[in-house]
């Protein structure tokens, strides 16, 4: 006869491990007992359990409550056992020794491999700002046994670097994603993907990128200078910019206070019926936590009585 077992039994941390040991003998042969022991190299054998054909299962104190026979129906030639709730410390070599009648003793070894699935964590880098050079966007760390694989899934252009660290019963991998921040990256997902044989599917952690920026400011409303004449109603200037975080707007007049009747409504400056008093240099000041920008325009209110139109200057400054 001969013993049938597996070279390697692989289980995920916390699962039950079936340690197979089946005696395939000739007809009439009987199994008297099966002894299971742990036999890691460099250490003496440590008994797990003894399966006796007459007296049943005896589990050694170190494995009390953790070793069982598989559920019935049971074949009398089957010496397999279940190791409940496998932990990392269970990983190693195991041996089953089968005493048969009349063929004698047989032994076989197997290796138990306990997979420890990683619990990845993603740590965002510092605040991203447009104009920075290559900057850490996020780092992702996963530790397990065996070492997990850590990659990135994103449409954003960047560079990655990885380090791995060997620990007592596992290996850790950390990967960093660096990029040159630009406003187009705002709201883009950056996903850390962790693969491991103990996972049914890849684990994914997504970080949404936020890049602070402030666009140049410009002022609309003076495109047709001929509309800016005495008596015109509904004249307005609109300040154009965009930013992250969203900017706030402030209007001032460079050559004095804002004329009475002029209304400030966020990015818009509304005028009452125009008079020559409304001529002047107006400044739109745009700011957010990241930066500030200015744009100034010169308003020249035309008097229809006069023939010659006057120039209108647009100046943008930051």
């Amino acid at each position: 006869g001969e013993l049938e077992t597996s070279d390697v039994v692989t289980v995920v941390l916390g699962q039950d491990a079936k340690l197979p040991c089946f005696y395939r003998g000739d007809s009439g042969e009987q199994v008297g007992q099966v002894a299971w022991a742990r036999v890691d190299a460099g250490e003496g054998a440590q008994e797990l359990a003894l399966l006796h054909s007459k007296y049943g299962l005896h589990v050694s104190p170190a494995y009390e409550g953790r070793v069982e026979q598989p559920p019935p129906p049971r074949n009398p030639l089957d010496g397999s056992v279940l190791l409940r709730n496998a932990v990392q410390a269970d990983e190693g070599e195991y041996e089953c020794r089968v005493s048969t009648f009349p063929a004698g003793s047989f032994q076989a070894r197997l290796r138990l491999r306990v997979l420890v699935p990683p619990l990845p964590s993603l740590n965002p880098g510092p605040a991203l700002e447009e104009g920075q050079g290559l900057t850490l966007a996020a780092s992702c760390t996963a530790e397990g046994s065996p070492a997990p694989s850590v990659t990135w899934d994103t449409e954003v252009k960047g560079t990655t670097s990885s380090r791995s660290f060997k620990h007592s019963r596992s290996a850790a991998v950390t990967s960093e994603f660096h990029l040159v921040p630009s406003r187009s990256m705002n709201g883009q997902p950056l996903t850390c993907v962790v693969s491991h044989p103990g996972l049914l599917q890849d684990q994914r952690i997504t970080h949404i990128l936020h890049v602070s920026f402030l666009a140049e400011a410009s002022v609309r409303g003076l495109e047709d200078q001929n509309l800016w004449h005495i008596g015109r109603e509904g004249a307005m200037l609109k300040c154009l910019s965009e930013g992250q975080p969203p900017p706030s707007y402030n209007w001032t007049r460079l050559d004095g206070p804002l004329p009475s009747g002029v209304r400030v409504d966020g990015d818009t400056l509304g005028f009452p019926p125009l008079t020559t008093e409304h001529s002047g240099i107006y400044v739109c000041h745009v700011s957010n936590e990241f930066s500030s920008r200015d744009s100034q325009v010169t308003v020249d209110v035309l008097d229809p009585q006069e023939d010659s139109g006057k120039q209108v200057d647009l100046v943008s400054a930051s």
Epitope: N123, S139, T141, E143, G144, F165
Partner: antibody, heavy 118, light 107 residues
Framework: QVQLVQSGAEAKKPGASVRVSCKTS????????IHWVRQAPGQGLEWMGI????????SYAQKFQDRVTMTRDTSTNTDYMDLSSLRFEDTAVYYC???????????WGQGTMVTVSS | DIQLTQSPSFLSASVGDKVTITCRAS??????LAWYQQKPGKAPKLLIY???TLQGGVPSRFSGSGSGTEFTLTISNLQPADFATYCC?????????FGPGTKVDIK
């Protein structure tokens, strides 16, 4: 706020063992690694080892490999560092510090003075 | 193990000065370097990580640069609170080692 609070000063004889504790609060315990660092009087900082927050796996500096044990108790959010076979040269301030992944140590305990003398 | 050396080991400076401290690694560590400030009887405080990234809440007069084997910590416009010992740390591989430190005191 985030805090790492260490146990009080210890005086030990050569050959004895010491246990230093580090109680963490203000953050999710399992998301950070804990390191132990020591500093002998008038000397620089010396990294002793690291413990994984979720797996109990460790890595120790070679120098301490045979004498140090780092453990944790998730029920109380406390880490422990045991150092055995103490020598005079183990007299130092022992710090615990946390790191997110393998980044720099952003929060440190206040330190525990361990004095070894006969 | 990766060795870190710092220069100078001692530095005298005045308030308002610009101070530069160098840290050299015995082998390449990419940008996996941190800088700490330590005052007597206190735990170290993180200033810079990833060689050049300023830790939140740290004044912008502190800056870091370098990669590979040579790194620099610069304090522009030195303030009274900055008189302390500064040390670097590599996080490229185990064991994570520290530099011996640079003591900055008042001239």
């Amino acid at each position: 706020q985030v805090q790492l609070v260490q146990s009080g000063a210890e005086a030990k004889k050569p050959g004895a063992s010491v246990r230093v504790s580090c109680k963490t609060s203000g953050y999710t315990f399992t998301n950070y690694y804990i390191h132990w660092v020591r500093q002998a009087p008038g000397q620089g900082l010396e990294w002793m080892g690291i413990i994984n927050p979720t797996l109990d796996s460790t890595s120790y500096a070679q120098k301490f490999q045979d004498r140090v044990t780092m453990t944790r108790d998730t029920s109380t959010n406390t880490d422990y560092m045991d150092l055995s076979s103490l020598r005079f040269e183990d007299t130092a301030v022992y710090y615990c510090a946390r790191s997110a992944g393998f980044d720099a140590f952003d929060i440190w305990g206040q330190g525990t003075m361990v004095t070894v003398s006969s | 193990d990766i060795q870190l050396t710092q220069s100078p080991s001692f530095l005298s400076a005045s308030v308002g000065d610009k101070v530069t401290i160098t840290c050299r690694a015995s082998q390449g560590i990419n940008s996996y370097l941190a800088w700490y400030q330590q005052k007597p009887g206190k735990a170290p405080k993180l200033l810079i990580y990833s060689a050049s990234t300023l830790q939140g809440g740290v004044p912008s007069r502190f800056s870091g640069s370098g990669s590979g084997t040579e790194f620099t910590l610069t304090i522009s416009n030195l303030q009274p609170a900055d008189f302390a010992t500064y040390c670097c740390q590599q996080l490229n591989s185990y064991p994570f080692t520290f530099g011996p430190g640079t003591k900055v005191d008042i001239k």
